[in-house]
């Protein structure tokens, strides 16, 4: 699996969306999980509705929503208000039985608020054509990790 | 065994909002699955699902009613209770409540006798 | 709104078989299971198939339940006076996010 990178604003809101193949994963729960480490477990943070016809009902855990749109073979994951400690790497996971497939790796990204005076320095701020209201979409910038990257920091 | 049995009045005056009760046993509606529907069908037409609610108080409405619907529970009295506001006379129909079993499928398995209720001024 | 297609009216004669069929799209009927019901007149509806081809205990198996693509039927065969009756199908719509019911085909026996 290649790894995608979501790049969210720090204090907006961050959607990963994560395609599959909707007859394949049919009648599947989804999850997502963070990745402990670059081999250990995957941890659930939230899975959709038990009732697999009502995966479409928003599922929260904490700050984290999950929604499942079976027809179009799309599993959204909301991370509201994204904190620097939420950045590392994730899973989308199909469910079945105790086994899981991975549908897509995620890495995410946590940006520092433009916003933020605190940490000024040379950030972006709107020009006079901008509005602090377009500021504050929510953000999904999304990229391939390049052959060679590593989403994790190399262990000594 | 299971049984639900619908009650509430059998006249409503147009813009008034019906309130429906459905009193069931033979099961619970803490069991995962299980739920309670409110479906209805005007006079020499077709069957028309308005409603479910079922355990962790998720409930799910018709799209056409949405904004007119509200579903909810009393789990400890086993009832289940529809409230429809802005009533008009396209609204007279039969109200049935049925248990509903719902995970990759959905159906109605159980039925109560239904209740008609006649929108009229 | 109608959003599953049934013919409004089938006819047979005692002992003859009669198909009833159910008309959908890749949303309801292509992507789920098929429920279909018999409203005997003046009654409450029941449960006839579940999951497409099931029979709860109770109804003989004379009814029968089958799903091709997005369409459904309900055989019955060997058809008796008691069968004249109101039959509806039912499906999940994943666009709608609902529950949605046939128009309902009234099954006279001739």
């Known amino acids: 699996h290649n790894t995608t990178v979501f790049q969210g604003v720090a204090g907006q809101s961050l959607q990963v969306s994560c395609p599959y193949d909707s007859m394949k994963h049919w009648g599947r729960r989804k999850a997502w999980c963070r990745q402990l480490g670059e081999k250990g477990p995957c941890q659930r943070v939230v899975s959709t509705h038990n009732l697999w016809l009502l995966s479409f009902l928003r599922r929260w855990n904490g700050s984290t929503a999950i929604t499942d749109d079976t027809l179009g073979g799309t599993l959204t994951i909301t991370l509201r208000n994204l904190q620097p400690h939420d950045a590392g790497l994730y899973q989308c996971q199909s469910l079945h039985g105790s086994e899981a497939d991975t549908l897509r790796k995620v890495l995410v990204e946590v940006l520092a608020d433009p916003l933020d005076h605190r940490d000024a320095g040379d950030l972006w701020f709107p020009g006079e054509s901008e509005s602090f209201e377009d500021a504050h979409v929510e953000h999904s910038i999304s990229r391939s990790l390049l052959e060679g990257e590593i989403p994790f920091p190399p262990t000594s | 065994q299971v049984q639900l049995k619908e009650s509430g009045p059998a006249l409503v005056k147009p813009t008034q909002t019906l309130t429906l009760t459905c009193t069931f046993s033979g099961f619970s509606l803490s069991t995962s699955g299980v739920g309670v529907s409110w479906i209805r069908q005007p006079p020499g037409k077709a069957l028309e699902w308005l409603a479910l609610?079922?355990?962790?108080?998720?409930?799910i409405y018709s799209t056409s009613l949405k904004t007119r619907l509200t579903i909810s529970k009393d789990t400890s009295k086993n009832q289940v209770v529809l409230t429809m506001t802005n009533m008009d006379p396209v609204d007279t129909a039969t109200y049935y409540c049925a248990r509903t079993l719902i995970d990759r499928s959905v159906y109605f398995d159980y039925w109560g006798q239904g209740t008609l209720v006649t929108v009229s001024s | 709104d109608i959003v599953l297609t049934q013919p409004p009216s089938v006819s047979g004669a005692p002992g003859q078989r009669v198909t009833i069929s159910c008309s959908g799209s890749s949303s309801n009927i292509g992507h789920h299971y098929v429920s279909w019901y018999q409203q005997l007149p003046g009654t409450a509806p029941k449960l006839l198939i579940y999951d497409n081809t099931n029979r709860p205990s109770g109804v003989p198996d004379r009814f029968s339940g089958s799903k091709s693509g997005t369409s459904a039927s309900l055989a019955i065969t060997g058809l008796q006076a008691e069968d004249e009756a109101d039959y509806y199908c039912?499906?999940?719509?994943?666009?709608?996010?609902?529950?949605?019911f046939g128009g309902g085909t009234k099954l006279t026996v001739l």
């Open positions: 609610i079922f355990s962790d108080h998720d409930k």
């Open positions: 039912a499906t999940w719509d994943g666009l709608m996010n609902s529950i949605v």
